[in-house]
Interface confidence: low
Amino acid sequence: DAHKSEVAHRFKDLGEENFKALVLIAFAQYLQQCPFEDHVKLVNEVTEFAKTCVADESAENCDKSLHTLFGDKLCTVATLRETYGEMADCCAKQEPERNECFLQHKDDNPNLPRLVRPEVDVMCTAFHDNEETFLKKYLYEIARRHPYFYAPELLFFAKRYKAAFTECCQAADKAACLLPKLDELRDEGKASSAKQRLKCASLQKFGERAFKAWAVARLSQRFPKAEFAEVSKLVTDLTKVHTECCHGDLLECADDRADLAKYICENQDSISSKLKECCEKPLLEKSHCIAEVENDEMPADLPSLAADFVESKDVCKNYAEAKDVFLGMFLYEYARRHPDYSVVLLLRLAKTYETTLEKCCAAADPHECYAKVFDEFKPLVEEPQNLIKQNCELFEQLGEYKFQNALLVRYTKKVPQVSTPTLVEVSRNLGKVGSKCCKHPEAKRMPCAEDYLSVVLNQLCVLHEKTPVSDRVTKCCTESLVNRRPCFSALEVDETYVPKEFNAETFTFHADICTLSEKERQIKKQTALVELVKHKPKATKEQLKAVMDDFAAFVEKCCKADDKETCFAEEGKKLVAASQAALGL
C-alpha cells in the first residue's frame, strides 16, 4: 500500500527509538570508517526531518524514497573522498544505482581496531553517565564491523546488552555478573553475523530462487505439520525481509519482520505446536525466538514420496505445468520427512531430481528413465554422513585445539595462497564444528554440522572475494552454493604451489606471548603452524607435530624463565634451527 511519505510511514510503524537505532545501523554499515559522533549527527538530522513528515506528509522532500533521503545524507559527509576513495564516486550516481554502489563498497573485513573490553567499573560508569550514548555506541561498533548484520536482530542484541548492564552494574560483584553475559552476547553475535552473511551471499550471488529453495527446505523441516501453501507464504515473506535487510533497506526489513512474526503467531495452529512460548514474548524476543524455534514433530503416517514423485504417470505433466512449484513441493515433502538431513543435502537432492526430470521428460520413455531417480540419492546422503563420522571421531580423539590444527594443515595444503589470518580464522571456526555438533545424536549431527560448515565456508568466500588469490577458492565459492563444502572437501594438496621463502622473523617470539589469553596464545601458535605448512607443504603430520610440540615446550619454558626476553631470543634461535633441520628447510 502506497504512502505519501515513506519516511513518515516507517517512523510511525517503528517508533522513534527503533527508527533512530535502525538508521544508525544503516549508516554505520555503509560508512564503516566514519566517527561515531558524525553518524549520530546524521541520524539526528534524519530523525528531525522524519518528524516534520509525520506532522505533515506533504511537506517538502517528504515524498522522496528512503534511499534518496539516506543517500543524500551520506553524501554530505565532508571527508568522503579522503576516507573512502572511490566510494565517493557513488554520490555522482542517481538512485537506484547510487545505493547499489554503496552496497558494493561494504567491506567484510574493515581495517578497524579490535574491540577491547574496558574494565567493568569503567563500562558501568559510562553506562550510568549516558545510557543512550553507551547503547548507540554498541550498535555503531557492531554494525560497522559487521556490515551485513541482521538489523532487527541487532536491536534484540542491544536490548540484552542494556539489560545486562542494568542488572549487573548494581550487582555486588559486577564482573561475575556481567562478563559471562558479554561473552555470551559476543559469541552469539559473531554466529548471528556469519549466518546472516550467508543469507545475503545467497541472495546477492545466487539469486532469489536459491534463497527461496533454502527457505522452503529449512521451514519445512521446522514446520512439518504446516501445509505447502502455508510454507510457501512464509518463504515469500521471509525472502522479502532478508532481501530488504541485505539491500540496506533496514526500516522496511524491521517493519516486515515484525509483520511476519505477528502473522506466524496469529496462525500458529496451522504452522507449528512449538510456537506458543515464543508468541507470548515482546516483539524483539518473539522474532528471535521464532527464528530459533525447534522443529515440530513430524505428522504420523506420511505416505511414501515415491507415489507422487516417481510412480505417478503425471510426473512430467506436473513438472511441465509449473516447474518451480512442483520442485518446491518435492523439496517440501522431502524436507518435512528429513529433519535429520542438512538443508544443503536436501537442496542437492532436489537439484538431482530436477536434472533427472529435465533429461527424462524429453526422453522416449520418461517413466523408465526416471524410475530409479531415488537410487541416485544414496551416495549423496552417504557422503556427508561418512565425512561427519570420520571428523567427529578425529575430534573426539584430538580435542578442539588439535582438531583445529589438523584442519589448519588440511586447508593450508589445499589453498596455500590464502592469507594466513584468513586461514587461521576459518580453520578455527571449522574446528568448532566438533564441540558444536559431535555431541548430538546421529539424527541431529548432519543438519548441525553441514549447515554450520556452509556458514563458515561462506566467511572464507567473502573474505577471499575482497582479495582473490586462489582460482580453486574462487571456483568452489562461485560454481554452486550447495556444493561448496563438497568442493572444498574434494580439494587435494595444491601441487602447483611454490613454497614460501623461509623467514626467521615469522618464527620469532617475544615475552608478550606469556601475558596473552589462552585463545590468543593458540592463535599465535596456529599462525606459526600455517606459516610452517606454507614453507613446507609436503611436511608430514608427524614432522609438523614434532615441531609444534617443541614450540609449545619452548613457550612454556620461556614463560617460566626469570629473564623471559633473553630466553625467547636464545631458545628461539635454537628452535628455528631445530625446526629447519626437522623439516629439511
Epitope: R160, A163, A164, T166, L179, P180, E184
Partner: nanobody
Framework: EVQLLESGGGLVQPGGSLRLSCAAS????????MLWVRQAPGKGLEWVSV????????YYADSVKGRFTISRDNSKNTLYLQMNSLRAEDTALYYC????????????WGQGTLVTVQS
Amino acid sequence: EVQLLESGGGLVQPGGSLRLSCAASGFTFDTSSMLWVRQAPGKGLEWVSVIHQSGTPTYYADSVKGRFTISRDNSKNTLYLQMNSLRAEDTALYYCAKFPSSRMKFDYWGQGTLVTVQS
C-alpha cells in the same frame, strides 16, 4: 520439566573443604551456562561463580577467588563447586541456577544446599 538438585552441603570446620554437586535435567545442559549463588542468613543473594557451557571461561566473586573452583561434567549433566579453605563467612544456602541465554532473568533455580562453617 526443568529440575536442579543440589547436594554436598554440611557442617565443616574453618579451613576445611566441601564439594557441592548440582544434578540438572529437563533442558539441554551442555548448551547452558550455569552458576552458583549463595544466600547467607539474613542477607541478600550473592554471586559465587559462573561457568560457560563449554567449561571455560569461568568467573568467581572476589570473596571466593583462589579458594573455590567451579566445574561441570556435561556427560553427566552435573555442575560442581569445590570449596577449599572455608571461612565462617562462607556459611550460606548455596543454589545452582541456569544462566539466562535470552531473557535476562534466572529462569530456573534449585532448592539449595546448606553449608555451615563453624569450629
